[in-house]
Interface confidence: low
């Protein structure tokens, strides 16, 4: 019995269906096929869980959190024992193992390993201003999404015709900050932060209005 090499890892957006591949070759009839799918969750590597089991011609549920969401992709018994997981959750991220036995066929590699990463698009980021908006001050524009896997990067743009930030601005796309030094009237306007990762983008807008000092009445 020989389990085929798996592609290594599967990535899927949260809420979508993941298909975890596992196939094997055997010299024996599939009369005594036994398949166990296990997961080592990323969130708790010390606590392996059973996902689904096929034994004695019957399917059995694994851990409670997989109930109603998991099944074999094809009719069992078969040499393709791939499974699907519906409505994927963040907690489904982990290393999945399929363990295959088909007596009397012994020997060979009987384990396949596939990583599953559940991706989450950036949630709507928060745009904020730190610092005084008085003429000549330094301000920091902040942008941050609560959620996002992989971790989002942040791109700030000034929504004028050029999409360029003012010349006195420095941007940190990892932290989501823009520092604008010595703000002037030209710094005023609408700024957009675009939070993005491999599977999505989300934006927020911020209106920066530089306050000019009022002329003092004599």
């Amino acid at each position: 019995l020989e389990v085929s090499e798996s592609p290594g890892s599967v990535q899927v957006a949260r809420g979508q269906t993941a298909v975890l591949p596992c196939a094997f070759s055997t010299s024996a009839a599939l009369l005594n096929l036994n398949v166990i799918w296990m997961v080592i969750p990323l969130s708790n590597a010390n606590q392996p869980e059973q996902v689904i089991l096929y034994q004695g011609g019957q399917m059995f549920d694994g851990a409670l959190r997989f109930h109603g969401r998991v099944g074999f992709t094809g009719t069992m018994p078969a040499t393709n024992v791939s499974i699907f997981i519906n409505n994927t959750q963040l907690s489904d991220t982990g290393t999945y193992q399929c363990l295959v036995n088909n007596l009397p066929d012994r020997g060979g590699r009987n384990i396949g390993v596939t990583g599953l990463t559940v991706l989450v698009p950036p949630s709507a980021p928060q745009c904020q201003i730190q610092g005084s908006q008085d003429l000549g001050s330094d301000v920091i524009l902040l942008c941050s999404s609560e959620e996002g896997i992989p971790r989002p990067t942040y791109l700030w743009e000034k929504l004028d015709n050029t999409l360029k930030l003012p010349p006195t601005a420095t941007q940190d796309q990892v932290q989501g900050t823009v520092t604008i030094r010595n703000i002037s009237a030209l710094s005023s306007g609408l700024y957009q932060c675009v939070a993005s990762n491999a599977i999505g983008t989300s934006t927020c807008l911020l209106d920066l209005q530089v306050i000019s000092p009022q002329p003092r009445s004599v």
Partner: antibody, heavy 121, light 108 residues
């Protein structure tokens, strides 16, 4: 004077592709963001996509995301819309429009005359 | 996505009358980033108003825009024969930019 001339429209079968062009003249093309907007026969306007002055930023309507690609060649003063996996609901007159000088989100005064795309088997 | 609802669908008026067109947004339009366009049959749209109340270059002063947040209005103080057309509002405060379904101003 400012001129925008669309071309590339026609009749195409569902699932096929088409590329629209918009030739610009009378202004410094490389300084302006550009939009595509469409209008189904007898219907209202629907914004399709926008591209920044240098092509580094692009945004799409959800209805075309993943199927349409906006691009530009500033050396040729030309805006493009590559439309793949066309559907019957993509049937419309497609307009290119120049952003206003002060706000790249405002479509501005200048629009092409439109080119008709008909998706039909 | 911000949905814009225009009312009425059709406005039947005579030349010289005042036209009031309404545009209501499903959520607040950031910084009054709202535009109005005019479209005549067989023609491309023409920008009238941007920023809710700023008239575009060359637009007669009988066209005015007002409003903020979710409620916006286009007013044509005295209708001229060339003003009979379809009018669209559009928000550009958040992506995707969206248009209203249009109001047709027709001759009574």
């Amino acid at each position: 004077q400012v001129q925008l001339v669309e071309s590339g429209g026609g009749v195409v079968q569902p699932g096929r592709s088409l590329r629209l062009s918009c030739a610009a003249s009378g202004f410094t093309f490389s300084s302006y963001a550009m939009h595509w907007v469409r209008q189904a026969p007898g219907k209202g306007l629907e914004w399709v996509a926008v591209i920044s002055y240098d092509g580094s930023n692009k945004y799409y309507a959800d209805s075309v995301k993943g199927r349409f690609t906006i691009s530009r060649d500033n050396s040729k003063n030309t805006l493009y819309l590559q439309m793949n996996s066309l559907r019957a609901e993509d049937t419309a007159v497609y307009y290119c429009a120049r952003a206003s000088p002060s706000q790249w989100l405002v479509l501005g005064h200048y629009w092409g005359q439109g080119t008709l795309v008909t998706v039909s088997s | 996505e911000t949905t814009l609802t225009q009312s009425p669908g059709t406005l039947s008026l005579s030349p010289g009358e005042r036209a009031t067109l309404s545009c209501r947004a499903s959520q607040s339009v950031s910084s009054s980033y709202l535009a109005w366009y005019q479209q005549k049959p067989g023609q491309a749209p023409r920008l009238l108003i941007y920023g809710a109340s700023s008239r575009a270059t060359g637009i007669p002063d009988r066209f005015s825009g007002s409003g903020s947040g979710t409620d916006f209005t286009l007013t044509i103080s005295r209708l001229e024969p060339e003003d009979f057309a379809v009018y669209y509002c559009q928000q550009y405060g958040s992506s995707p930019w969206t248009f209203g379904q249009g109001t047709k101003v027709e001759i009574k």
